[in-house]
């Protein structure tokens, strides 16, 4: 009578998360009596994945009937595999024994591997806004792929990034793997639309890559130029000056005029026009009554855009001996204006 | 708890037929492989036949083959024994027996009188 | 067809051993049953070999050796009493077989 073997066909198995894995073993023989049982690794500290004899191992089944009598076929199937089933697993015969069954011959071992899709990958950028001509570091992470090889890619509107470093973790082997990456983003003043896209290929995704953004509008801040100028008269002693608010990102925006350094009205920006870069314009006007002045006036629109230091410009408003002739701008005329921070 | 319920015994004349029933339940039925056996009057424990767990594989003793057959349903959790050519050896208690993994018995039913008598 | 002493006897308390011989130990795994009374539903003490199913009381134990099973009732009561079978299943033939009964009496 021949000796019995364990024959494990296949020398390794390749399946995708999710799905099920089939390990196939057969016994050449019934005799010596006694059960077949399934580990993962070798050795005392290898894990029971099926006992034949007794046991409950709610993700594993049968291939086969192995009530039949005759049955020699003691493949199983896994269901629901994780990157955490990966390793090699043994189809091992017992021989009855007292008290303890006795291990009689193992299969060669069969690998399984398991293949993960990458998570979806996150894009996060810096905690604090950056005004143009500034480099900002975004961040791109996915996690729980296998293999291990990966490809990640850094697109500004579409072009190809150059300048990022990329590491992938675990160095040595894992059961399933993360990457990271830092992406340098220099900034410009139209970027207010602009998106920061990290894409991931991985051999699970089957040529279709997964893809991260992050909107550089969440990023960038765009300050405020200003102009103030002076309008023609509206009514007698009265003159009506702009302060002219250009291209700032983002929308908060508080604007305060002062007349001689003392504050006159502060407002808020509310009904603001969008360029289309996508930053905004707003104008404040100022109705200053002449005849209230004895000295030239000093009349200072002061911004303070999204919580930064004020900016200003100033406008010198003469005050004329005849206020009539205010329109032929010899009264009331522009001196000049000159941009100062405020701190 | 398992409990296994022989019925269709009775009273035949020989070269008559009878179907044996036995109602399982207290497990899943369709995860084990069944048996019976009998015990003819003032006698020992006889294994007739055995069925696996599907259904497709079937085993007897030699002296029944050909006029014994061994069923079952699983969706109605039932074990059958269909008798033909009955003679007054086969007047016996019979039992339905559930299988271990390795083809031993573990659970009995209370049993099932058959009597084959002219 | 496997051998079994027709009966055996023993006092309260006492260790009773039953043997069963004619399987192959390599091919034969063996079982024991209980049977109080003829006709009545025999009850499973031991099977393969050496497992007890958890409502049998432990001072029932079994044990196979060569081509030999024993049955073993350390401190036997008087509701022991019984006919104890021994059945095996041969790998080889996929048969079950049964010995013929040991009547056992508690004195």
């Known amino acids: 009578e021949e000796e019995l073997q364990v024959i494990q066909p296949d020398k390794s198995v390749l399946v995708a998360a999710g799905e099920t894995a089939t390990l196939r073993c057969t016994a050449t023989s019934l005799i010596p009596v006694g059960p077949i049982q399934w580990f993962r690794g070798a050795g005392p500290g290898r894990e029971l994945i099926y006992n034949q004899k007794e046991g409950h191992f709610p993700r594993v089944t049968t291939v086969s009937d192995l009530t039949k009598r005759n049955n020699m076929d003691f493949s199983i199937r896994i269901g629901n595999i994780t990157p955490a089933d990966a390793g090699t697993y043994y189809c091992v015969k017992f021989r009855k024994g007292s008290p303890d069954d006795v291990e009689f011959k193992s299969g060669a071992g069969t690998e399984l591997s398991v293949r993960a899709k990458p998570s979806a990958p996150v894009v996060s950028g810096p905690a604090a806004r950056a005004t143009p001509q500034h480099t900002v570091s975004f961040t791109c992470e996915s996690h729980g792929f296998s293999p291990r090889d990966i490809t990640l890619k850094w697109f500004k509107n579409g072009n190809e990034l150059s300048d990022f470093q990329t590491n992938v973790d675990p160095v040595g082997e894992s059961v399933s793997y993360s990457i990271h990456s830092t992406a340098k983003v220099v900034l410009t003043r139209e970027d207010v639309h602009s998106q920061v896209i990290c894409e991931v290929a991985h051999v699970t995704l089957q040529g279709d890559p997964l893809r991260g953004t992050a909107n550089l509008s969440e990023t960038i801040r765009v300050p405020p130029t200003l102009e103030v100028t002076q309008q023609p008269v509206r009514a007698e002693n009265q003159v009506n000056v702009t302060c002219q608010v250009r291209k700032f990102y983002p929308q908060r925006l508080q604007l305060t005029w002062l007349e001689n350094g003392n504050v006159s009205r502060t407002e808020t920006a509310s009904t603001v026009t969008e360029n289309k870069d996508g930053t905004y314009n707003w104008m404040s006007w100022l109705l200053v009554n002449v005849s209230a002045h004895r000295d030239d006036v000093k009349l200072t629109c002061q911004v303070e855009h999204d919580g930064q230091p004020a900016v200003s410009k100033s406008h010198d408003l003469k005050v004329s001996a005849h206020p009539k002739e205010q329109g032929s701008n010899t009264a009331a005329e522009n001196t000049g204006s000159n941009e100062r921070n405020i701190y | 708890d398992v409990q296994l319920v022989e019925s269709g015994g009775g009273v035949v004349r020989p070269g008559e037929s009878l179907r044996l029933s036995c109602a399982a339940s207290g497990f899943t039925f369709s995860s084990y492989a069944m048996s019976w056996v009998r015990q003819a009057p003032g006698k020992g424990l006889e294994w007739l036949a055995g069925i696996s767990a599907g259904g497709s594989d079937t085993y007897y003793i030699d002296s029944v083959k050909g006029r014994f057959t061994i069923s079952r349903d699983n969706p109605k959790n039932s074990l059958y024994l269909q008798m033909s050519s009955l003679t007054a050896e086969d007047t016996a208690v019979y039992y339905c027996?559930?299988?271990?993994?390795?083809?031993?018995?573990?659970?009995w039913g209370l049993g099932t009188l058959v009597t084959v008598s002219s | 067809a496997l051998t079994q002493p027709a009966s055996v006897s023993a006092n309260p308390g006492e260790t009773v051993k039953i043997t069963c011989s004619g399987g192959d130990y390599y091919s034969t795994y063996y079982a024991w049953y209980q049977q109080k009374s003829p006709g009545s539903a025999p009850v499973t003490v031991i099977?393969?070999?050496?497992k007890r199913p958890s409502d049998i009381p432990s001072r029932f134990s079994g044990s196979a050796s060569g081509s030999a099973a024993t049955l073993i009732i350390t401190g036997v009561r008087v509701e022991d009493e019984a006919v104890y079978y021994c059945?095996?299943?041969?790998?080889?033939?996929?048969?079950?077989?049964f010995g013929a009964g040991t009547t056992l009496t508690v004195l």
């Open positions: 059945g095996g299943y041969d790998g080889r033939t996929y048969i079950n077989t």
């Open positions: 027996a559930r299988e271990t993994w390795n083809h031993l018995f573990d659970y």
């Open positions: 099977h393969s070999d050496d």
